[in-house]
């Protein structure tokens, strides 16, 4: 277990020409807040997939009113860190989305209005327990500067927060079976710690962070008794018995998620999975439209002219995700056929074809034997994108132009002498051997170990190999 911490340093116009206008005005004062979404790994997850590592929403920043005629400065930020607690191991590699939101405080009918100012996304490697990492990301004309780190919650330690350490009880050594906790040599590895909150009476664990229930109890922390009577609308099945759960009050009762969000219980609270266009702890932040510029990397926003209609981003080749925020490894789709080498040039895919193949995707099999003559009665055989000649007896080489020496490979065994012949080779066997290649010994009593010599051919006579 541990906490991912994000510190926003500044949000304002990026360098270069075309500074953005301030998002707030005297007529329409506003304030900023931030949302961070974390997903494990560097995998190409769909952008709309849930923030599996966790998400957090900052407090609202100070109210800001633009000074007439002044360029947009760095905007006032909310106080404090954004903290995303993680329950299990820190994955080491993670994907993040940081969104900058504007809350307009003018005379809005029905309260304040929210709009997305900028969204940045990235993938990083980070060890827990390390120093703050600094980053700068640009979204259009805006620039976001921030730092982040992952730290373990005691007693967890290590780069993944999977090792558990406690202070030594004795000054010299750790308890039986427990090793010192490098690099914290003054601490010892701790016995297994179950998931935080796991019922000590009704739960147990075999792996750190898990909570397995004894029979008759269920729920993520084994605190919910299983009812043996049948029930019509159980909250969920029990892994321990076939009974039903006593409905009991739960964090998702009454569905705290607004705007059609779906609620799922977490050990400490609940999590809302929001439909496209809605964000926030309870999906209360709404109304992302094409006017908010949700499409990145040259994506075109289609539809979504008003808050009630969902937008779609048409992504340029090479990008995907609901906001075109993820680069596609187009070569991973293996578009080049017949063993061609794929090159993603950014503006286009190229296939470098093997010999004998052509076309944009190496899809055309060239006629390998077209215009290829095999000499001396050889025949052309296609295959593998290259032509090959099957040569007549006595000839070899790529085009059967070379006269083969049938004796070059020393084919006669047991000291037999080889003679080239117009139809192949002849082996003159040494005394005691026979066969086309002199491979069979002749027994002393005159019987051969294998088939008898053909009629009229005595052992020791030359054998012609056809």
């Amino acid at each position: 277990a541990g906490v991912f911490e994000l510190q926003i340093h500044s949000f304002g116009p990026g360098p270069g020409p075309g500074a953005p206008r301030s998002p707030c005005s005297a007529r329409l004062p506003c304030r900023l807040f931030f949302r961070v979404c974390l997903k494990p790994g560097l995998s190409e997850e769909a952008a709309e997939s849930p923030c599996a590592l966790g998400a957090a929403l900052s407090a609202r920043g100070p109210v800001y009113t633009e000074q007439p005629g002044a360029p947009a400065p760095d905007l006032p930020l909310p106080d404090g860190l954004l903290q995303v607690p993680f329950r299990d191991a820190w994955p080491g590699t993670f994907s993040f989305i940081i969104e900058t939101w504007r809350e307009e405080l003018g005379d809005q009918i029905g309260g304040p209005a929210w709009s997305l100012l900028a969204r940045v996304a990235g993938r990083r490697r980070l060890a827990a327990g390390g120093p703050w990492a600094r980053d700068i990301q640009r979204a259009g004309a805006w620039e976001l500067r921030f730092s982040y780190r992952a730290r373990c919650e005691p007693p967890a330690v290590g780069t993944a927060c999977t090792r558990l350490c406690r202070p030594r009880s004795a000054p010299s050594r750790c308890g039986p079976g427990l090793r010192p906790c490098a690099p914290l040599e003054d601490e010892c590895e701790a016995p297994l710690v179950c998931r935080a909150g796991c019922s000590p009476e009704h739960g147990f664990c075999e792996q750190p962070g898990e909570c397995r229930c004894l029979e008759g109890w269920t729920g993520p922390l084994c605190t919910v008794p299983v009812s043996t009577s049948s029930c019509l609308s159980p909250r969920g099945p029990s892994s321990a018995t076939t009974g039903c759960l006593v409905p009991g009050p739960g964090p998702c009762d009454g569905n705290p998620c607004a705007n059609g969000g779906s609620c799922s219980e977490t050990p400490r609270s609940f999590e809302c999975t929001c439909p496209r266009g809605f964000y926030g702890l309870r999906c209360e932040v709404s109304g992302v439209t094409c006017a908010d510029g949700p499409c990145f990397n040259g994506g075109l926003c289609v539809g979504g002219a008003d808050p009630d209609s969902a937008y779609i981003c048409h992504c340029p080749p090479g990008f995907q995700g609901s906001n075109c925020e993820k680069r596609v490894d187009r070569c991973s789709l293996q578009p080049c056929r017949n063993g061609g080498l794929c090159l993603d040039l950014g503006h286009a895919l190229r296939c470098r074809c093997r010999a004998g193949f052509a076309g944009p995707r190496c899809e055309h099999d060239l006629d390998d034997c077209a215009g290829r003559a095999c000499a001396n009665g050889g025949t052309c055989v296609e295959g593998g994108g290259a032509h090959r000649c099957s040569c007549a007896l006595g000839f070899g080489g790529r085009d059967c132009r070379e006269r083969a020496d049938p004796c070059a490979a020393r084919p006669c065994a047991h000291g037999g002498r080889c003679y080239a012949h117009f139809s192949g080779l002849v082996c003159a066997c040494a005394p005691g051997y026979m066969g086309a290649r002199c491979e069979f010994p002749v027994h002393p009593d005159g019987a051969s170990a294998l088939p008898a010599a053909p009629p009229g051919l005595r052992p020791g006579d030359p054998q012609r190999y056809l």
Epitope: G18, A291, C301, P317, A348, P360
Partner: antibody, heavy 118, light 108 residues
């Protein structure tokens, strides 16, 4: 070198369907979006629609009910059909390639004039 | 849809002079998704600038683009004889893709 060439009849009768084909050379049709744009004589440019080889299309709402864009990857071609034409559809019709950096047009055909007249 | 208004409609200048063409959007164009094209009589348009300020391949450096939000500018620092043409802006932030009405740069 990327080249685009429009082809199709230069004269179409009112209420009929205008059909044009764009043949692409020097680029794989599977690697880009492809678009049609038109320009009435002496006027500005109007985007008609685009297509991706996967079949994704997007049309200008002002023409959507009459437009169909299709693609033939085997011939490296894409086509435009505009139904129920009137004299207001008389224009030079351009086919163009959409760039990878965004939905702007980096290569254009030389254009073909289509006149709608009886 | 985003409506692009170009001004002036016609610009009469001499070779060697500086030309400044304006393109104003009815709504903010996000991430500066704006392109400029040049069109000569009887020819197809030619891409000059994309991303509001990035020059396309092979475009001379006398052409430059600037601006953000709703106001964009194409500047030709010293007009050459071959620069007299019609110039169009185009936004590609959201659908439908739209062009400005064009600015004709003619010889004075």
């Amino acid at each position: 070198q990327v080249q685009l060439q429009e082809s199709g009849p230069g004269l179409v009768k009112p209420s009929q369907t205008l059909s044009l084909t764009c043949t692409v050379s020097g680029a794989s049709i599977s690697s880009f979006y492809w678009s049609w744009i038109r320009q009435p004589p002496g006027k500005g440019l109007e985007w008609i629609g685009y297509i991706y080889y996967s079949g994704t299309t997007n049309y200008n709402p002002s023409l959507k009910s009459r437009v169909t864009i299709s693609v033939d990857t085997s011939k490296n071609q894409f086509s435009l059909k505009l139904s129920s034409v009137t004299a207001a559809d008389t224009a030079v019709y351009y086919c163009a390639r959409i760039a990878v950096a965004g939905f702007f047009f980096d290569y254009w055909g030389q254009g073909t004039l289509v006149t709608v007249s009886s | 849809e985003i409506v692009l208004t170009q001004s002036p409609g016609t610009l009469s200048l001499s070779p060697g002079e500086r030309a400044t063409l304006s393109c104003r959007a009815s709504q903010s164009v996000n991430k500066n998704y704006l392109a400029w094209y040049q069109q000569k009589p009887g020819q197809a348009p030619r891409l000059l600038i994309y991303g509001a300020s990035s020059r396309a391949t092979g475009i001379p450096d006398r052409f430059s683009g600037s601006g953000s939000g709703t106001d964009f500018t194409l500047t030709i620092s010293r007009l050459e004889p071959e620069d007299f043409a019609v110039y169009y802006c185009q936004q590609y932030d959201r659908s439908p893709l739209t062009f400005g009405g064009g600015t004709k740069v003619e010889i004075k």
